[in-house]
């Protein structure tokens, strides 16, 4: 017997659908109407035939009351080839829902997204996460998607992007965006970061995550942030192969005084990098390759320092006294 494609948990909270059949029975998804969290995985299907069955240009207001009644707050859609027109149709309908967080993963968006009609209302998302989503429109995809969203977006995550740089002149400002996560774009690099951080389009950024993005030095990142006028409070540069030394010919970069938390864990560092901010609330240097203790001018002034998992702290090292240089915590690095 074929397993049911959709499963709703006992609390009617989470519903997961895996449509792996070539001709799936999409009506099975109706059992998810009572769920708060919904995940729909389409098994890599091409949803082009759907366009023939639905009127993408129909006025979504006719569904408004039904959609408003849905409990869904978090929706994940994955593994499909989706015509842009169909995506737009879904966004128009969802604009009447109470959806707050939308995740799109492993999608191929085909065709171009039409402009937002004057009478249409944008989707009031607080969080939008994209992972491995490709767009036929290349660099202008964010601007096209943005017009279908209300300006209150707080969290934007773009991973494994095929084009992590945006066409900045078309992108409008994200006035409420406090968290931007560009992690898992290993080809981004510091120059790509400059292109992705469209100047003055992210005025409210507080948290910037750049894990596994091909960053090379903290100073290079500092320069990219300064060029874009982005002043995060928290910056995550973990899981990059960082160089500790700065190119002597490169100009010194002054970190924004707003930055108070810096994650440099899993960065392959053999020494504390030069050119860090002078004062930080949090500095994470765990799981690097530091083979000696830092000397006083090698660390910024830090309230909360994490060094666990570095060779110089490894238990069994001869220590001058109990507790010296040893946190007693051995993380799995």
């Amino acid at each position: 017997t074929t397993p049911e494609p959709c499963e709703l948990d006992d609390e009617d909270f989470r519903c997961v659908c895996n449509f792996s059949e070539p001709q799936p029975d999409w009506s099975e998804a109706f059992q998810c109407v009572s769920a708060v969290e919904v995940e729909i995985h389409a098994g890599g299907l091409n949803l082009e035939p759907f366009l023939k069955r639905v009127d993408a240009d129909a006025d979504p207001r006719q569904y408004a009351d039904t959609v408003k009644a849905l409990r869904v707050r978090r929706l994940t859609v994955g593994a499909a080839q989706v015509p842009a027109q169909l995506l737009v149709g879904a966004l128009r309908v969802l604009a009447y829902s109470r959806l707050k967080e939308l995740t799109l993963e492993d999608l191929k968006i085909t065709g171009t997204m039409p402009p937002l009609p004057l009478e249409a209302t944008g989707l009031a998302l607080s969080s939008l996460r994209l992972r491995n989503v490709s767009w036929a429109t290349g660099r202008s995809w964010l601007a096209e998607l943005q017009q279908w969203l209300k300006p209150g977006l707080k969290v934007l995550s773009i991973a494994q992007a095929h084009s992590p740089a945006f066409s900045c002149e078309q992108v409008r400002a994200f006035p409420a965006l406090t968290s931007l996560d560009l992690s898992d774009n290993p080809g981004l690099g510091e120059r790509g970061l400059m292109a992705a951080l469209c100047p003055h389009k992210f005025p409210a950024i507080q948290n910037l995550a750049l894990r596994n993005t091909g960053m090379e030095t903290p100073t290079g990142v500092c320069a990219a942030l300064a060029a874009a006028g982005v002043q995060p409070h928290s910056l995550d540069l973990s899981h990059n192969s960082l160089r500790a030394t700065v190119n002597p010919s490169a100009p010194r970069c002054m970190w924004s005084s707003a930055l108070n938390s810096l994650n440099l864990s899993f960065a392959g560092l053999e020494q504390v990098p030069k050119g860090l901010p002078a004062k930080l609330r949090v500095l994470d240097l765990s799981c690097n390759r530091l083979n000696r203790a830092p000397q006083p001018d090698e660390l910024p002034e830090v309230d909360n320092l994490t060094l666990d998992g570095n060779p110089f702290l490894v238990p069994g090292t001869a220590l001058p006294h109990e507790g010296s240089m040893n946190s007693g915590v051995v993380p799995a690095c």
């Epitope: 203790a293 909360n304 001058p320 915590v329």
Partner: antibody, heavy 125, light 108 residues
Framework: QIQLVQSGPELKKPGESVKISCKAS????????MNWVKQAPGNGLKWMGW????????TYADDFKQRFVFSLETSASTAYLQINNLNIEDTATYFC??????????????????WGPGTMVTVSS | DIVMTQSPTSISISVGERVTMNCKAS??????VDWYQQKTGQSPKLLIY???NRYTGVPDRFTGSGSGTDFTFTISNMQAVDLAVYYC??????????FGGGTKLELK
């Protein structure tokens, strides 16, 4: 075992210079910063500053920025303190002391765990 | 720079008694205070680091406490070998570091 051995006592005239040494043994010299501390006769301890043994970069306390020079001879695991243009107020015992880093669940710092025996410098006309 | 004020400057004490001395920082130093013992004609020795941590080999009659601006060092059962000058030092995470003026322990 860890030892810091300092050079012997010095008697100097005002205006002269003195260079005292601190030879470290029993540990990797470049893994620990070296500090200098002054103690005038009958007085307390005064931290003069420190030198990064990796880079050779010195840092001086405010009262010791003019005539005082910290230096290293890394190959000999030796730190030096030179005082130029000596005056009577420089009469004191000068200690070298190693800064050891400690770290325990988010908290860190340095303390002086090994000290040299001190070098007495007397400045008298 | 942070000023460390030690009190009293000297204490007369008998063997077996409990002795307490204080150190006040001119600004908040968290728990970044160390205590050193210096006997006549010798170099100082580390007793307590980070306000309350006893260094290796230091007898448990020596204890330290405090945080912020007020710190205390106690010898619970004074021995003749403890006669010395005791110094506090603020070792805030970045220099400059500063010593207190010292407290001299004398026999009654």
């Amino acid at each position: 075992q860890i030892q810091l051995v300092q050079s012997g006592p010095e008697l100097k005239k005002p205006g002269e210079s003195v260079k005292i040494s601190c030879k470290a043994s029993g540990y990797t010299f470049t893994d620990y910063a070296m500090n200098w501390v002054k103690q005038a006769p009958g007085n307390g301890l005064k931290w003069m500053g420190w030198i990064n043994t990796q880079t050779g970069k010195p840092t001086y306390a405010d009262d010791f920025k003019q005539r005082f020079v910290f230096s290293l001879e890394t190959s000999a695991s030796t730190a030096y303190l030179q005082i130029n243009n000596l005056n009577i107020e420089d009469t004191a015992t000068y200690f070298c002391t190693r800064s050891t880093f400690y770290y325990s669940s988010y908290i860190y710092g340095w303390y002086f765990d090994f000290w040299g025996p001190g070098t007495m410098v007397t400045v008298s006309s | 720079d942070i000023v460390m004020t030690q009190s009293p400057t000297s204490i007369s004490i008998s063997v077996g008694e409990r002795v307490t001395m204080n150190c006040k920082a001119s600004q908040n130093v968290g728990s970044n205070v160390d205590w050193y013992q210096q006997k006549t004609g010798q170099s100082p020795k580390l007793l307590i680091y980070k306000a309350s941590n006893r260094y290796t080999g230091v007898p448990d009659r020596f204890t330290g406490s405090g945080s912020g601006t007020d710190f205390t060092f106690t010898i619970s059962n004074m021995q003749a070998v403890d006669l010395a000058v005791y110094y506090c030092m603020q070792s805030n995470t970045n220099p400059p570091w500063t010593f207190g003026g010292g407290t001299k322990l004398e026999l009654k």
